[in-house]
Every structure is written in structure tokens, then in C-alpha cells.
């Protein structure tokens, strides 16, 4: 236990990147019943880790907020230059105001156009969404069942005729190997037959007779 508390006192090490496991590993968890493993971490250590995670999350949020503030500042500084008034008089300032007003009007016009486009798009999206709902109502969805399917069958389904060609190609590639393995298969097959013969009623009969 002392071990655990001394860990918390030390700098928290960055967690290693999670190992990418194959989905088949997780399928096993889903299908097979398994005993719940007993946690090796104590409740106090768990609390410490939770607190630490919350602290990190808080810092991350603060950093993001700061980044957003900085981004806003940068965006404004590019759009709104600092006023350079040195050497400019009443006439220029008057003209500058006129220029800036004209710029504001132009931006307002653009904003109005963009808003109109956005409103139009929103309306279109709403209409299309409604159509989707209407169509959904007309057709009853079949309940989908999980189907076991081989890679070749999947290829065939997805690619159609093209998949057939690729499968043929694969067949050609495998032909050489097949000749070598056929013998083994035959032997294995014979051995299986013997086992089957003995394991059934026939086998028992033969044993009894002998």
C-alpha cells in the first residue's frame, strides 16, 4: 500500500499509447462468459487517479480556452489593423471614417448574402429530412441478422464479376501448393475414416466380434 501512495507523490508519468488490439480479441469477450477479474488497485489509489485525471482534464480545458482566446485575438488582429493616425489630420480621418463605413457596409452586405444562403440551406435540409422520414414510414425495415460469411463470399457479394476473376487468379496461385498437399489430405482422410468406423456402432460390433 505504501507503494501506491509514494506513486501518487511522484510526477504522474504520461500513460503509454494504448495497444491496438484486433477486434477478434473483443469478440471473445462479448460471446464467451468470463469471470470478472479482481481489481489490483485499491479504492484510495483509484480516487487519487481519478483526481489526477480530473486535474489533467481541467488543465486541458483551460489550455483549449486560452488557445481559443489567442485564435480570436489573431483573427481580429488580421482583420482589424491598429489605427495609424500619426501625421493624419482631420481631412484624412474623415475620409478614413468614410472608407471604414464603406467597408462595414460591404461586409454587412456579404453577411446578409451568406445568411440568406445559410437560411436556404437549412430549409432544404429540413425538407430533405422530412422526405427521409416520410420514406421511412412507407417501407418497413427488415430485421437484420448477423451472418457468418467467408472472405471470398464477401468479395463475391461486393465486387460481383470482378471478384470471380480475382478468385480464379487465387485458384491458379494455389494450384501448385494443392498437388503437394493432396497426398497429406488423403492420408488424413483415411485415418479419419478408421476412427469414424471404430467410434460408431459398427466399430463396437467389430470389437465385440473380434
Amino acid at each position: 500500500m505504501a507503494d501506491g501512495s509514494s506513486d501518487a507523490a511522484r510526477e504522474p508519468r504520461p500513460a503509454p499509447a494504448p495497444i491496438r488490439r484486433r477486434s477478434s480479441n473483443y469478440r471473445a469477450y462479448a460471446t464467451e462468459p468470463h469471470a470478472k477479474k479482481k481489481s489490483k488497485i485499491s479504492a484510495s489509489r483509484k480516487l487519487q487517479l481519478k483526481t489526477l485525471l480530473l486535474q489533467i482534464a481541467k488543465q486541458e480545458l483551460e489550455r483549449e480556452a486560452e488557445e481559443r482566446r489567442g485564435e480570436k485575438g489573431r483573427a481580429l488582429s488580421t482583420r482589424c489593423q491598429p489605427l495609424e493616425l500619426a501625421g493624419l489630420g482631420f481631412a484624412e480621418l474623415q475620409d478614413l471614417c468614410r472608407q471604414l463605413h464603406a467597408r462595414v457596409d460591404k461586409v454587412d452586405e456579404e453577411r446578409y448574402d451568406i445568411e440568406a444562403k445559410v437560411t436556404k440551406n437549412i430549409t432544404e435540409i429540413a425538407d430533405l429530412t422530412q422526405k427521409i422520414f416520410d420514406l421511412r414510414g412507407k417501407f418497413k425495415r427488415p430485421t437484420l441478422r448477423r451472418v457468418r460469411i467467408s472472405a471470398d463470399a464477401m468479395m463475391q457479394a461486393l465486387l460481383g464479376a470482378r471478384a470471380k476473376e480475382s478468385l480464379d487468379l487465387r485458384a491458379h496461385l494455389k494450384q501448385v501448393k494443392k498437388e503437394d498437399t493432396e497426398k497429406e489430405n488423403r492420408e488424413v482422410g483415411d485415418w479419419r475414416k478408421n476412427i469414424d468406423a471404430l467410434s460408431g456402432m459398427e466399430g463396437r460390433k467389430k470389437k465385440f466380434e473380434s
Partner: antibody, heavy 121, light 107 residues
Framework: EVQMVESGGGLLKPGGSLKLSCAAS????????MSWVRQTPEKRLEWVAT????????FYPDSVKGRFTISRDNAKNTLYLQMLSLRSEDTAMYYC??????????????WGQGSSVTVSS | DIQMTQTSSSLSASLGDRVTISCRAS??????LNWYQQKPDGTIKLLIY???RLHSGVSSRFSGSGSGTDYSLTISNLEQEDIATYFC????????TFDTGTKLELK
Amino acid sequence: EVQMVESGGGLLKPGGSLKLSCAASGFTYSNYAMSWVRQTPEKRLEWVATISSGGSYSFYPDSVKGRFTISRDNAKNTLYLQMLSLRSEDTAMYYCARRDNYYGSSFMDYWGQGSSVTVSS
Amino acid sequence: DIQMTQTSSSLSASLGDRVTISCRASQDITNYLNWYQQKPDGTIKLLIYYTSRLHSGVSSRFSGSGSGTDYSLTISNLEQEDIATYFCQQGNTIPLTFDTGTKLELK
């Protein structure tokens, strides 16, 4: 000593283009707005353009708007005037001047010696 | 645009004279008026800004006055070096405009 030296003038045909330069010295160039003023052969003075200290804002009379562009390079202490689609009425001596202001009143407190531009067919 | 006009395009005076050059604006320019001197060699200098403020290095013999649309430049004791052309310029509205100038000559 505040000094402005214009260069780049010349003789050219109507529709031609030219870029004038003005090298400034003796003051903190980036702190001042600058102007171009021309003097016609009839000795009339005409304001041509003004640029703010940082170069963000520029001002022109309608007679040159869209044809002339004032710009500056604060690192090089140089003022420029790009002139396009030149006309015979643009023939003049072009002066570069420093701007200053006092309670909203702006004025050209130091002038260069001028650079001659002649537009003729 | 604001038009600037001078009462006379040329003026003759003797050394030591008190000379007044007038300038009129087509509308009120709220004292935003400047005076420039152009020597025969083409050199241009600022003399007075904001109607009556004397630019640094300019002789106190020069003074300016006026308001609204009417303004004037006065040279109290004419000297040889003052022989030049004088321009007024309004700084109230863009475009900035100058008058045609008054050429000062010796009698």
C-alpha cells in the same frame, strides 16, 4: 537633417506606367504618414496621394484613384508611387513630402526636390 | 472639392515692405489652413500651419491669420530671400487642395 530624395521619373507615352521612389532619412520614417504632391507645368500644386505611417490606409483624389498606388517599405525608409495608364495631364514634377499634424490640422512639413514625369506621344 | 483662390496671382513689393497675401476657401475650412513657400529653384518649404502656427526654423517675420473662409499670410519686413511663390492649402477635407499661388516680385 530631414531629407527626401525622389527618383524614377522619365519620359513615356500615354497609357504607359512608371514607379517613383522616395528615399527618406534624418527621421523615424515609420512614425510618419507620407504624401506625394505634383506640380503641373502651369505651376499648380496638386495633392496626389497620402499613406498612413504603417501603410494600412491610403488616400487619393478622384483624378488618380484606381490608376495610382502609394505604398511604403518602412524597413527601407522608402516611399513609392506606382502610376498606371498615364495620361498627358499627369505630366508634372512629383514631390514626396512628410506629413505631420497639429490638433487635427495635417500639413506637409518637409519636401523632396522632385522627380520629373513627362507623358507625351 | 474645396476651391482655394488667391486675390492676386502676382505681387510687387520693395525690400523692407510689409506684404499681405490673401487666400479664400469656397467653404469654411475651420482654420485647417497651411502656407508654403516655393523658391525659384523649385524648393518647397512649410511656413505656417493651422492658420497661424509658425513652423520650426521659419523666420518670425512671417505670420498668419484668418478664420472661416478668409485667411492671410503677412511678411512684416520683406527681404531678398523672401522672393518666391506662396501657396495656401486647406486640410479640412479630402481632396486636399492648393490655390494657384501668388508670385512675389521685387518692384
